[in-house]
């Protein structure tokens, strides 16, 4: 069951998933000047059986220099045209192994992919929040949100996180400080970004991520 909407937006915070439940869909979108190959997949899908999970299909982009069915709608500032260098140059990681049963890892980047990754989450997915650079986390409970099914409708739980404007940031374990506004976007566009291409799931984290992850960050 797909979740009807995105996880909640928290001012001055971003969210990310550590692993993706089977059934999660990822849009195959291409950066400007490129398009999906003819009859190419619109999505990748996390599928699997009891032993392992993997992403089916492959997103493929090709140059749109020739006449095609993709148009740029509005010109973008130069800095928005490319993903952050650190993301595009991240090491390829196996996509057929998940750190948790029934979950897929972050798919490796594909050539000329779009600047954003757009996921469609399923019921039971958990995402974790962090404050952007320049903000410090005050938390009254878990800095996470779970997609739940209630009375036949899906909803995301509200993360108990407030980001205050102090020059200190709360980070995901093992990750460098995030940029305050990824790819130069205004703050209003950053509160619900999932920029996880360069994130590698750490095995030691996976065992605890459903329970005590980030607790040391907020104590």
């Amino acid at each position: 069951e797909l979740c009807d909407d995105d996880p909640p937006e928290i001012p001055h915070a971003t969210f990310k998933a550590m692993a993706y439940k089977e059934g999660t869909m990822l849009n195959c979108e291409c950066k400007r000047g490129f398009r999906r190959i003819k009859s190419g997949s619109l999505y990748m899908l996390c599928t699997g059986n009891s032993s392992h999970s993997s992403w089916d299909n492959q997103c493929q982009c090709t140059s749109s220099a020739t006449r095609n069915t993709t148009k740029q709608v509005t010109p973008q500032p130069e800095e928005q045209k490319e993903r952050k260098t650190t993301e595009m140059q991240s090491p390829m990681q196996p996509v057929d192994q998940a750190s948790l049963p029934g979950h897929c890892r972050e798919p490796p980047p594909w050539e000329n992919e779009a600047t954003e990754r757009i996921y469609h989450f399923v019921v039971g997915q958990m995402v974790y929040y962090q404050c952007v650079q320049g903000y410090r986390a005050l938390h009254r409970g878990p800095a996470e949100s779970v997609c739940k099914m209630t009375h036949g409708k899906t909803r995301w739980t509200q993360p108990q996180l407030i980001c205050t404007g102090e020059m200190e940031t709360s980070q995901f374990p093992g990750e460098e400080k995030p940029q305050a506004s990824p790819e130069g976007r205004p703050e209003s566009e950053t509160s619900c970004l999932v920029t996880t291409t360069d994130f590698q799931i750490q095995t030691e984290m996976a065992a605890t991520m459903e329970t005590s992850i980030f607790t040391t960050e907020y104590q």
């Epitope: 797909l2 009807d4 909407d5 995105d6 059934g23 849009n27 979108e29 291409c30 400007r32 999906r36 009859s39 190419g40 997949s41 619109l42 999505y43 899908l45 599928t47 089916d56 299909n57 069915t69 993709t70 148009k71 740029q72 709608v73 509005t74 973008q76 779009a114 600047t115 954003e116 757009i118 469609h120 566009e189 619900c192």
Partner: antibody
Framework: QVQLVQSGAEVKKPGSSVKVSCKAS????????INWVRQAPGQGLEWMGR????????DYAQKFQDRVTITADKSTNTAYMELSSLRSEDTAVYYC????????WGQGTLVTVSS | ENVLTQSPGTLSLSPGERATLSCRAS???????LAWYQQKPGQAPRLLIY???SRATGIPDRFSGSGSGTDFTLTISRLEPEDFAVYYC?????????FGQGTRLEIK
């Protein structure tokens, strides 16, 4: 619950253009595809194209490539579909719909092309 | 493009009966990306099923979807008077997104 509200009916002359709007309320706008579909009187559904507002990139069915432009204004949560060089066979109800498994749909906009 | 062919074109049944609508795709691999819609005269279509078998929010459980590969089925287990309408299948796994031509479900 997300709702899509479209602009009102239009009567156009052959050769002119029409621009239909689709305003979203009650949910995430910029991260989900907004699709445009049309239905001629007594006919089936025909996909025209889609846009993902946050990426500002649209793609189109080959049939409409040269005549349609889909745009989105993230500040007002509104998507637009402009169809140019109208002809009588473009008379149809035009729908917007969210996500690629279309849910929900706008109420539809009747565009009549007549001289 | 992935062409969808629906059958039958028209299905005549009585309330209380079981309806089985078919949709065949020209290309396989669309099983996770197949949707079904219901449309009544003068109304916008309504999503019934996505992902071949997942019911959309608020859809009664008498509607069910099944199938994989290239052959898909929408089943209405026990027809209610309000179920008589036109039904469309749609694939959204590859571009262009395509629809079947529709099946008209009419009262016998």
């Amino acid at each position: 619950q997300v709702q899509l509200v479209q602009s009102g009916a239009e009567v156009k002359k052959p050769g002119s253009s029409v621009k239909v709007s689709c305003k979203a309320s009650g949910g995430t706008f910029s991260r989900y595809a907004i699709n445009w579909v049309r239905q001629a009187p007594g006919q089936g559904l025909e996909w025209m194209g889609r846009i993902i507002p946050i990426l500002d990139i649209a793609d189109y069915a080959q049939k409409f490539q040269d005549r349609v432009t889909i745009t989105a204004d993230k500040s007002t949560n509104t998507a637009y579909m402009e169809l140019s060089s109208l002809r009588s066979e473009d008379t149809a109800v035009y729908y917007c719909a969210r996500k690629d498994w279309f849910d929900p749909w706008g109420q539809g906009t009747l565009v009549t092309v007549s001289s | 493009e992935n062409v969808l062919t629906q059958s039958p074109g028209t299905l005549s049944l009585s309330p209380g009966e079981r309806a089985t609508l078919s949709c065949r795709a020209s290309q396989s691999g669309s099983s996770s990306y197949l949707a079904w819609y219901q449309q009544k005269p003068g109304q916008a279509p309504r999503l019934l099923i996505y992902g071949a078998s997942s019911r959309a929010t608020g859809i009664p459980d008498r509607f069910s979807g099944s199938g994989s590969g290239t052959d898909f089925t929408l089943t209405i287990s026990r027809l209610e008077p309000e179920d008589f309408a036109v039904y469309y299948c749609q694939q959204y796994g590859s571009s262009p997104i395509t629809f079947g031509q529709g099946t008209r479900l009419e009262i016998k």
